[in-house]
Amino acid sequence: CRTSECCFQDPPYPDADSGSASGPRDLRCYRISSDRYECSWQYEGPTAGVSHFLRCCLSSGRCCYFAAGSATRLQFSDQAGVSVLYTVTLWVESWARNQTEKSPEVTLQLYNSVKYEPPLGDIKVSKLAGQLRMEWETPDNQVGAEVQFRHRTPSSPWKLGDCGPQDDDTESCLCPLEMNVAQEFQLRRRQLGSQGSSWSKWSSPVCVPPENPPQPQVRFSVEQLGQDGRRRLTLKEQPTQLELPEGCQGLAPGTEVTYRLQLHMLSCPCKAKATRTLHLGKMPYLSGAAYNVAVISSNQFGPGLNQTWHIPADTHTEPVALNISVGTNGTTMYWPARAQSMTYCIEWQPVGQDGGLATCSLTAPQDPDPAGMATYSWSRESGAMGQEKCYYITIFASAHPEKLTLWSTVLSTYHFGGNASAAGTPHHVSVKNHSLDSVSVDWAPSLLSTCPGVLKEYVVRCRDEDSKQVSEHPVQPTETQVTLSGLRAGVAYTVQVRADTAWLRGVWSQPQRFSIEVQVSD
């Protein structure tokens, strides 16, 4: 037989299908010009020493073969002995290792069999009513096709699906969308209405994320507040990466999950902007305020579930950084200014009450005064911190108050509001004899002691009613008792106690009279 012709003899190997898993498959035959034809196939398994034979049976029942050698593609003309106008059945037999392996048969009319391309170029993926919709431009001069898809997940094999007939300049397919796993899709086409025409090759992989992006499993830590009043938010655990099917590993456009960080600054609610969204890779610096932090995952189908954390406020207090002067017109606070043209947010709330009851005030941008201080004043009528109770005050600063991540904490401290001098006066002062020349003075703790760092000391004042001499005894703010010694028997004394803050002298308690009895010896 001539090599260019189909040989109508028995092939040079025994006629027996080994039924092995390897072998030829995906046979495609089509016209490539007015008088030339091509068949191609794939061979699965070791290729060394394999000879391929293209078999053809005519409608008359006569059969022939082409010897392709080790090639998996073969061209022939309409003069090769194969009927091109009538239906023929073709298959490939591969002779390897003393056994024959056969491909599935294709039955077609070669003249009308056109080589169809798979979807080429950009395949658009969208979600439609819980399903996946793929859309692509029909390859040139190939309108009218039957389309199939196959899909797999990282843990499942290929499954075949049908897209149905297409006959437009754009073709589309509805496919199943997985909720929680990524999928790889491939598409193939063949001529519509041409009985037995060959399928095109499979398209390049189309990688599709799950409908729900994976919930971010991340952990944060917050560093200590630095000298600049800011603390760094750091990511302790990176988000888990999506597991991808085999053909999507490496570069898999379409399955990307983007993680965004949404910051919500809970403190200082009177500022202009409370939330900011950032890329997860760019970890911000935060003030000492309280924040809610959400990590939002999203893919091409939109956002998924988010994970939210609460970052509590830094409660480290500066006992002396804030100076408060109370005058007839109102109250003024002074603190070390941060820089030129800073906006300050002063926030206060009664101690022991829910954070939602915080009040705040935003200053206009201000420069330091000649002493390098920033100030905030309010009138008594405003009612700010007017009640006689303990307030927690935090001052934040920013040169760009509209940018959430540029706030810093200037200071946090406690302040006793209202008329602290009078409200702090100790009550229930009592005097007990201690020895022949001393007494013990006790009192109930001042209300100022409920306000950390506010009560500087108690002062106990004793007055000799006769000589009018006075003594003053400083007492630690944690103590509510002092022993007065060196007293003289028979002298009439009065004792009073006051509670002082760093900048306010307290009001004396009501005088208590006492004396030490003169001891008469027998």
């Epitope: 020349d437 004793c462 000799d464 006769d466 000589s467 001499q469 003594s471 003053e472 005894h473 400083p474 007065l484 060196g486 007293l487 003289r488 002298v491």
Partner: nanobody, 123 residues
């Protein structure tokens, strides 16, 4: 034995201020603290102010309270008396003394005395 040296006296106009210093040496730990007394010509020595070495308790006469402030620097064993709003009645020799601090204070409670420093207030 405790030695006491006063300084800071001088002349001042009515309404003026002076700060007196008293530096102690020797066995200061045997005393409660330091007191200031004054003696005007032809008058008895009178108590002005006192302070304890430990605890910082302060003592003032009726006339000194509100105008004078006593303070101690333990590291230097020095006691200071800051006198404001001085008037001619404050003219006297001011003595520093160390000893037991009783209340009310009297000169006889104090065992160790300095030489004194003159304060003159003119109108």
């Amino acid at each position: 034995e405790v030695q006491l040296v006063e300084s800071g006296g001088g002349s001042v106009q009515t309404g003026g201020s002076l700060t007196l210093s008293c530096t102690a040496s020797g066995r200061t730990g045997s005393t409660d603290g330091v007191g200031w007394f004054r003696q005007a010509p032809g008058k008895e020595r009178e108590f002005v102010s006192a302070i304890k070495w430990i605890g910082g308790s302060k003592y003032y006469s009726n006339s000194a309270e509100g105008r004078f402030t006593i303070a101690v620097d333990n590291a230097k064993n020095t006691v200071y008396l800051q006198m404001n709003s001085l008037n001619p009645e404050d003219t006297a020799v001011y003595y520093c003394a160390a000893g037991a601090i009783m209340f009310p204070s009297r000169p006889r409670d104090f065992d160790f005395w300095g030489q004194g420093t003159q304060v003159t207030v003119s109108s």
